[in-house]
């Protein structure tokens, strides 16, 4: 029995619902009474959802899963996963048994966009050209881990004297803090770009330092 799933991972935003597609080709005269369908976590073999003896056996996965009962007879064995969490990320296997047996695994890639970066300066007053300043770029509650890029006002990458750290919260979402140490010129714009590699989403923050001497409120 050929079971088909998408080759590419299913990307789902944290808190949204995701559909893990799985299909099979029922033979003429097929009835749901013949169908045994099992969804389980590929790595741990933990049961997620099942259908047997013509009945939806329900969710074994935090009551957040559902089948599409009206579509099963047409060979649609897809699974709906509600309120996606970081912990859901991974591979799910769809097992279909009628008279024959087949299975296939589909990957769920969880993602969450990073917030617009907040920028802070230290020190933040009485600044003059030649002073060394620390600029911190902070962005919150994204997933998976971010990449952070700094550049000056002309778009030239700033790679030296950058320290980036990432911390996961209890939900598995990441806060990223990146610190740039730079010697000030007469004028300067410093931009921080926080990139989510899965969503290909960039969040930008920048600070412009002008004047001579420079002061901040």
């Amino acid at each position: 029995l050929e079971v088909q799933v998408p080759e590419d991972p299913v990307v789902a935003l944290v808190g949204t619902d995701a559909t893990l597609c799985c299909s099979f080709s029922p033979e003429p005269g097929f009835s749901l009474a013949q169908l045994n369908l099992i969804w389980q976590l590929t790595d741990t073999k933990q049961l997620v959802h099942s259908f047997a003896e013509g009945q939806d056996q329900g969710s074994a996965y935090a009551n957040r899963t559902a089948l599409f009962p009206d579509l099963l007879a047409q060979g649609n064995a897809s699974l709906r996963l509600q309120r996606v969490r970081v912990a859901d990320e991974g591979s799910f296997t769809c097992f279909v048994s009628i008279r024959d047996f087949g299975s296939a695994a589909v990957s769920l890639q969880v993602a969450a966009p990073y917030s617009k970066p907040s920028m802070t300066l230290e020190p933040n007053k009485d600044l003059r050209p030649g002073d060394t300043v620390t600029i911190t770029c902070s962005s919150y509650r994204g997933y998976p881990e971010a990449e952070v890029f700094w550049q000056d006002g002309q778009g030239v990458p700033l790679t030296g004297n950058v320290t980036t750290s990432q911390m996961a919260n209890e939900q598995g979402l990441f806060d990223v803090h990146s610190v740039l140490r730079v010697v000030l010129g007469a004028n300067g714009t410093y931009s921080c770009l926080v990139r989510n590699p899965v969503l290909q989403q960039d969040a930008h923050g920048s600070v412009t330092i002008t004047g001579q001497p420079m002061t901040f409120p």
């Epitope: 990320e89 998976p144 881990e145 990449e147 990458p157 990432q166 911390m167 996961a168 598995g172 590699p197």
Partner: antibody, heavy 122, light 108 residues
Framework: EVQLLESGGGLVQPGGSLRLSCAAS????????MSWVRQAPGKGLEWVSG?????????YYADSVKGRFTVSRDNSKNTLYLQMNSLRAEDTAVYYC??????????????WGQGTTVTVSS | EIVLTQSPGTLSLSPGERATLTCRAS??????LAWYQQKPGQAPRLLIY???TRAAGIPARFRGSGSGTDFTLTISSLQSEDFAVYYC??????????FGGGTKVEIK
């Protein structure tokens, strides 16, 4: 087959330099965070450095090597590098490269190279 | 930096016995913890990630548990190939990724 193969180790004098390479095969190298982990003789594992997925992406270092070691990657060549300068006796170790178990993430390493030995001695 | 402390340093047991290894974190790491096995002259091998999920191909006799600051790796019935050094590693806050000092499981 997913594989990592380190090279470039050897004997070097204190203050000298070495460049380690790690050739990857069997997976989409550009999708994975990579790390260097070392093990001094008779000691435990110490994470040395890591790099994010982009060419020229974010590099991370242990305090013990910051300013002396530089990690880089060439996604077109499926190769990870570790440039080691100002080497000290305490850098003597077997150096392993490791691949994260999931794309786009820095977590735990499920693929490791066989290791290359670096000896710093006069 | 999160410090991981493993105990005991050495565990002397016979084949067939149960091994219990512990790893304590200096601050909460949630379930962002992995366990590795390393045999002499070999690279480490990932056993457990997410504190309790077995990596591909790891036998069911290896079981990880715990969350927060206290973690346990249990080997239900030691086989001859299980005598090795075991390391825990956290990946909640980084850099740096940090490893525990290791527990050696040796034949009694």
């Amino acid at each position: 087959e997913v594989q990592l193969l380190e090279s470039g180790g050897g004997l070097v004098q204190p203050g000298g330099s070495l460049r380690l390479s790690c050739a990857a095969s069997g997976f989409t190298f550009s999708d994975y965070y990579m790390s260097w982990v070392r093990q001094a003789p008779g000691k435990g594992l110490e994470w040395v450095s890591g790099i994010s997925i982009s060419y020229g992406g974010n590099a991370y270092y242990a305090d013990s090597v910051k300013g002396r070691f530089t990690v880089s990657r060439d996604n077109s060549k499926n190769t990870l590098y570790l440039q080691m300068n100002s080497l000290r006796a305490e850098d003597t170790a077997v150096y392993y490269c490791g691949r994260d178990r999931s794309p786009y993430q820095y977590r735990s390493m499920d693929v490791w190279g066989q290791g290359t030995t670096v000896t710093v001695s006069s | 930096e999160i410090v991981l402390t493993q105990s005991p340093g050495t565990l002397s047991l016979s084949p067939g016995e149960r091994a219990t290894l512990t790893c304590r974190a200096s601050q909460s790491v949630g379930d962002f913890l992995a366990w590795y096995q390393q045999k002499p002259g070999q690279a480490p091998r990932l056993l457990i990630y997410g504190a309790s999920t077995r990596a591909a191909g790891i036998p069911a006799r290896f079981r990880g548990s715990g969350s927060g600051t206290d973690f346990t790796l249990t080997i239900s019935s030691l086989q001859s190939e299980d005598f090795a050094v075991y390391y825990c590693q956290q990946y909640k806050n980084w850099p740096p990724l940090t490893f525990g000092g290791g527990t050696k499981v040796e034949i009694k």
